[in-house]
Each structure stands twice: as structure tokens, then as C-alpha cells.
Amino acid sequence: IVLRPSRVHNSEENTMRALTLKDILNGTFSYKTFFPNWISGQEYLHQSADNNIVLYNIETGQSYTILSNRTMKSVNASNYGLSPDRQFVYLESDYSKLWRYSYTATYYIYDLSNGEFVRGNELPRPIQYLCWSPVGSKLAYVYQNNIYLKQRPGDPPFQITFNGRENKIFNGIPDWVYEEEMLATKYALWWSPNGKFLAYAEFNDTDIPVIAYSYYGDEQYPRTINIPYPKAGAKNPVVRIFIIDTTYPAYVGPQEVPVPAMIASSDYYFSWLTWVTDERVCLQWLKRVQNVSVLSICDFREDWQTWDCPKTQEHIEESRTGWAGGFFVSTPVFSYDAISYYKIFSDKDGYKHIHYIKDTVENAIQITSGKWEAINIFRVTQDSLFYSSNEFEEYPGRRNIYRISIGSYPPSKKCVTCHLRKERCQYYTASFSDYAKYYALVCYGPGIPISTLHDGRTDQEIKILEENKELENALKNIQLPKEEIKKLEVDEITLWYKMILPPQFDRSKKYPLLIQVYGGPCSQSVRSVFAVNWISYLASKEGMVIALVDGRGTAFQGDKLLYAVYRKLGVYEVEDQITAVRKFIEMGFIDEKRIAIWGWSYGGYVSSLALASGTGLFKCGIAVAPVSSWEYYASVYTERFMGLPTKDDNLEHYKNSTVMARAEYFRNVDYLLIHGTADDNVHFQNSAQIAKALVNAQVDFQAMWYSDQNHGLSGLSTNHLYTHMTHFLKQCFSLSD
């Protein structure tokens, strides 16, 4: 299936040009998306091209400037947040990145009724997190690991917690491992729907071992960065959940929410919190051995001013074939009765589907079914449930939006997006206004991305929000590679792959092949999305064929494929890449003497193991910021898939699956190892150990470190990285510079 055919014809060839590396590094062909910042059923805010914050009213068709670019510029604001009562806006400036999601910033409050900044009782700086209540204009914020509350922006703050301490106790914000591997947010506090209560997590990292690495900076002596970071098998953070009444915060103070007994009996995690009503909250907990999850619905007891979590409102989700959930355990979407909910989990056939839980999980009503997976529940209204899945035409790498009418019996299903722009758009996400009165669809490809606005009742398209016209015009004289998504059937396993082919691809010729791999559990690389990136350039200009393969362990094709890697990381992911390469060679257009593999992070691990597989298939390869031993990586992630590194659990496979154990096998390949020295995620330690093992085995290899760079290798390092990797590959493939 050719998804992005080249527009090259002989008559046009003179005017067309190939992509250059400079195009990629400059972001010349980047696209824009439009996500409305919904503030009601029919209104959204958006930052205009000239940086005004503009309100759009869909019903009247009119626009209104609510915050001028001058006001934004006066405090160098890079972000804003409107209070729900529309009286105030917070302006965020001095953004300072911490980890993947977390950052600190300075906040100013602007009064929209008088057009002035609020003076008196200003916020301290820098703040770790700040948010408005869902109703009115109360403020909750985290400063120096403690939570504060303001009834109004100009009021003095009320301090909720007092035990916050850097790297020790975190209130309202996650520690490193919860941020990266469990919550995937910078915050750990949640307002109740009407702002009566504020729930928050407290993470105690006192006993967690610390990772320490040098940050070289510009000073005479390097700084040492210390992060409490639990590696596999190490002591984990201790989590507690508290709820405080924000109307009378001093009255009884924070009340702890009890942990279900079956969870509290051994090490556990808190995985998410969902408010149902102002007086009902749903907490999800997970055993440290992550195959048992408990969803606990708790109610406020007015008489005792406490939270009660009856056993009858505990719902257990257990996996017997792998870990609980996909990458994370899914979160519930409650219906209007405030007790029943919709949730995605595995059905009896091992496919993740939407279920409706009214009393017990055992009696759950399955809402979707088939040999495909429901991926996300976007919104549940009185009469409709909107979700995404990869059902359409049996392509796992697509995403379409569906509506199920839950107000009628039997429920009817409609694909909202399947036939909208079928060639251009096969991978969607959506953003809904209040009560799903309107919604935006954001199409990511395979054609040029487009964002559109729709009526939530009729699904009618109202207007195009962003169609990337400039990008379309810029690409008109570019020789883009061809892309195809197909599948290989091997030993009852379906291996979906994406192949990126040079513009003038000729099946009768031989091309060098580069495998790009990620391959981590519950990931997906073969997606019907638009991208003009480094591998596009390698195909367009350098004439390489690039392939991405989703093997065992990858997502959205059922539990059999997903859980195949359970407790055995580093085996089947590598096997499947190798199997695919052999199939590609059989196709006849691959030069089998010029095959390379590269990957980043988990992909660096897989590429390293593939290079060291002893197959002789790969001439060369690159590992960027690879994991080299699962004993070096975070507990929450690693143990989910590998269990514990103990003798009575899975220590043997922890030891067998290291890159270092295969050092000898690198002798016959060209290996480029790359890592940032300030990688807080996959520590430089991983590459240091690979390098040490290779040196000890007297194996030659190439390496590049990026001083003070983290897992993302951003900024100027990106340019250096891709330039360096390009030279390496061209040398490996004997391509002239």
C-alpha cells in the first residue's frame, strides 16, 4: 500500500530536489496542529500568530482578544491559564525544564476585569506547579515541595503541607520515577469537580538510593546532580494520598485516603486519581509486582470528615499472562450515575476493549470487541461514547475516532473519521468541548496533517483550523521518499512494517537497508503518520531503504504479541527484527552486504543486541542512549516487564539480557555508541559499562558522548548527533560524501 506516493515525473525532475540534512535539522518541513483550549461548550482560546490570546465563539462566529501580546510580553510570558470564572489569567514565564514533564516557572496573575496585574500577596518564585480550581478562581500551587492554597489570587496563601523537602518529601508533585514511569505528569494534585476538595499525593523518597552524576557546566568544579532514583529491585518511594477541604482548610486538615488491604500487604504504587463528584473519588493502586491493580471508589463521610473506601467498591484487575494494562493501567471514565464507569482492559480473547462496569468487574459488559484494540476513551456524554481504535481495515497503525450511542438499545457504532479524508488521514486524535458540543479532530497523516472543527451532534465539519498550506507548498518541489505499510506472516506472528523507499525506487536494483528500531513493550513504530525527518532524508538524498518493524512486545495487536516479552526482555524483540531483515533480503532489492540498524533508548538496547546477535546480517549500527542492563533502569518500568532481579524471581534473565554479556560478538560489526553525560533517565552508566566491556574484550568501536546533555540530546547536540550518524552510515554503506 503506497501511502505517500512521490510526485516525481520525468518532466518535473529538473525542478524537484531531494531532501537535505539541513532541511531536517532546520525543521523546514515541520507541521502545525491546532488543539483548541476549550473554555466552554462553544468557546475556545488560541494564541494567534501575533501572540494575542484570542477567544473564539463557534456559535456566533466571532473572535475576541482577551489578552494582548503586549501584556504577554510585559512579563515575557510563554504560557497562560484562564480561571474558570474568567476573572483572572495566570501568565507563566522563566520556564526552566527539570525532567520530562516537570519544570519550574514564575507566575503573574492578571485581572481581566480591570486590565491590571494583581498586586499584593504575589506568588513566590520559582513555582513547581500551579493550577486554578475547576470553578471560580482558587489557586493551588507547589513551592519548595509544599502545597499552598489561595481562595482568591490577591489573598494570602494557606499552607497545606509543611514536610516538603528537596529530594526527600514531595507534596503535590511526583518524584522522578512517578513522573516518568507512572503518572506521566508534572503534578500530583487533583481538584474535585467543583473545587470543594483538593486531593494530593505525598511521595517519601527518604530511603531511595540516589543516582549521582557530574554536570560540567562552566565552573572550575563540576556540579553533582543527585536524584533519588530506584533501579530495579531497589527501595521504592512510599506514597500516601490526602484530601483537604479547600473551603475550610484549617478545620480538620488533610485526611489520608486508606489503601486497599490487598494492596497494602506488600510494596505498592498509586497509579492515578479520578474525581467522580465533589464527594466521591476513585483511586487506582498497583502491587509492586505489577499484575494486580485495584480500583477503589471512596466516599466522603460528612459526620467524621473522612474518606471511606468500602471493599464493595474495590474492583480488581489482574493479568495472568503479563502485566496489568498496556503501558499503564487504563483509567476509568465515569458515567452520569457517578458509580458505573467505562474502562479499557483485556477481553477473554486477549484484546484490549471498552467494558462497562456497573457493579463488579466480573459482570462487566463488553462494549467493543474484535481482533483489534480500543485505544482511548475521549468522552462519555449522556448519549454517546467517543473512543479511538485501530479497527478500520485491520491496520494496527491507524487511529480512527468512533461514536457509540449509549442512550439507545442496542448501542450503535459509527466511525466518525474513517471516510473523511481517507487517503490523507488515517491517524487521528480528538479534543472535545464541554458536553462534547463541538470537537476538534487532529489528523497526523499519512498525508500532510490537518486539524478541523466539528459539530458534536451531527459530526459535520464546521471549519478547517489548520491545514499546513505553507508546508504543502514547500513540499511541492521536494522528492519525498515513498512509504508503504505492509505485513509479514512468520510462524503465526504478524510483523507489521513500514518501508521508506528512495523517490526513484527501482525493484530491480539493490539498496542499502537501515533498520530503525524502538521495540519497547507496548510501543508502536509502524504508524500511518506524516513525517519528514532524518530517515526521510536518508531515503530521499542518500538512496537508502529504511524499515521499521513492530515485533513481539509491541502494542495494539492483542495480548499474545504484547505479553510475549514478559520476563524475557531482549529476546523476541531482537529475533523479530532479524527475521524481518531476512524477509526484506528475500524481496530482492536489498544489498545484503550493506545492512545497518539504529535505535535510541530501548531502541539502542535492541540495536546493540541485534548487532551482537552473531547472525552476520548487520555491517554496522548505532545505539543512542541505550539501556545496557535492566539492573540499571528504573524499578517501575523494568519490574513491570521483568519482575525482580532476585534469585527466586528473575535474576538469571536480568544477567543474560545485558549488552555487556555479548561484548565479544561486536568484533565483526562497526558499532557507534552515543550517550549524553547528564542523562537522568537512561544513565550514562549504561554506555560506560558497554564501553568497558568492549575495551576488556579488546573490541574496537566508535563512541560519542554529549557533555551535560540528557536523554533527548537537544539543541546544538541534535545537529551534531545527526551529522555524526550520517557520516557513520555513509561510510558504512560506502556512499560518497
Partner: antibody, heavy 119, light 111 residues
Amino acid sequence: QVQLVQSGAEVKKPGASVKVSCKASGYTLTDYNMDWVRQAPGQGLEWIGDIYPNTGGTIYNQKFKGRVTMTIDTSTSTVYMELSSLRSEDTAVYYCTRFRGIHYAMDYWGQGTTVTVSS
Amino acid sequence: EIVLTQSPATLSLSPGERATLSCRASESVDNYGLSFINWFQQKPGQAPRLLIYGTSNRGSGIPARFSGSGSGTDFTLTISSLEPEDFAVYFCQQSNEVPYTFGGGTKVEIK
């Protein structure tokens, strides 16, 4: 301080057009929409329409559709409202009002322009 | 269009008394928890002046004796203690739906 100064009174014959101006000062014209409201003698208030100064985008009361045109001249910070095909029932005081979009509120008003339509 | 009905048409009160003005909408003017009902004061020969916006928020420089309340279809403007300068005509107005509409007004006169 915010000021909206409107043009002077007009007397027009039925079928003619009138163009009322409103000069804004004390704030940046493009930061707020401008609405027009009229008040017939001894009567209530009637909303005519709204203009978004950044693009000149307008919304009009259906009752005036086809007869009203709102325009803007950012160089002079002036907004105009033209009403055509005048009839006697268009006799009224016409007000320009600054419209604070986030609150959908007309927070400052011009002094009014009396338009008399008489044969 | 949304019709706003104000009552009473005239309110005769003495300075210092409490004034309660009513405004009823022909359909709900609630917009997801916010009601775009505004109140204006108009004195003879003058332009209207914004008193209350969004049902209950006082406009710039408006004294605390003026307050607004209500939701759905029923809204109230209250003047807790009438001052001599408060005797005027009061209009309610909705901005929830185009065309924006005004009530017929309540005249507050000296008894």
C-alpha cells in the same frame, strides 16, 4: 482613561444612509471588540452588531443584516457603523460600546449620536 | 431570540431602602456554569453604564451596594441601600446568544 467619542447628530431622509464614527482613546483599539447599540426615543436598547478589530470580522443582528456595515480604521483608532435604506423607525440614539469579550460585557459607552430620519 | 422581561416596570422607594429588581429570560442563559447577564444603569440624557457583568461581578468603580445574583432564567439586581444618585432606569441584558438582547428596563424613582 478610556474614552469613546462619537460623531455629531445627523438628520437623514428615508432611503438614505448614515455613517456614524466612534474614536477610541485611552486603550489600544485592537484589544477589544466594538459593539453598536441603539435606543429609540423613550424606548429600550437594541443591539446592532459587533466588530473584531484585528481582522474586521463582524456579527450583526439579523434584523439589520444587509443594511448595516461596520468597519475600522486602526490608523486613527476609529470604528464606523453605516446604516443604509433608512426609515423613520431608525430614528434613535446610536451608541458605540467597547465590548470585553471574555465577559461578553459592554464596559464603556460613547456619548451617543442622534440620528433622525425624516422626510 | 431570547426575550428578557424586567419587573416591576417602576419601583418607588426612598433613599436608604433596599431595591430588588427582577429580570426573567425566555430561555436559560446559562453557559456551562456562567450566566452572561449584565446590568446597566441609565440616567436621562446619558449613555448606559455597566454595573454588573456575568450575573454577579461588579463593574469597575461600582459601589458594593450593587449586587447581582441568579441562574438559568431568573436574575436579580439588588441595591442594598439606595443613595440619591441611584434613582435611574436599570436594564438587564443577555450576551449568551446572538442577537444580544436587553430587558425593557425598570425605573427606580423616589417615593
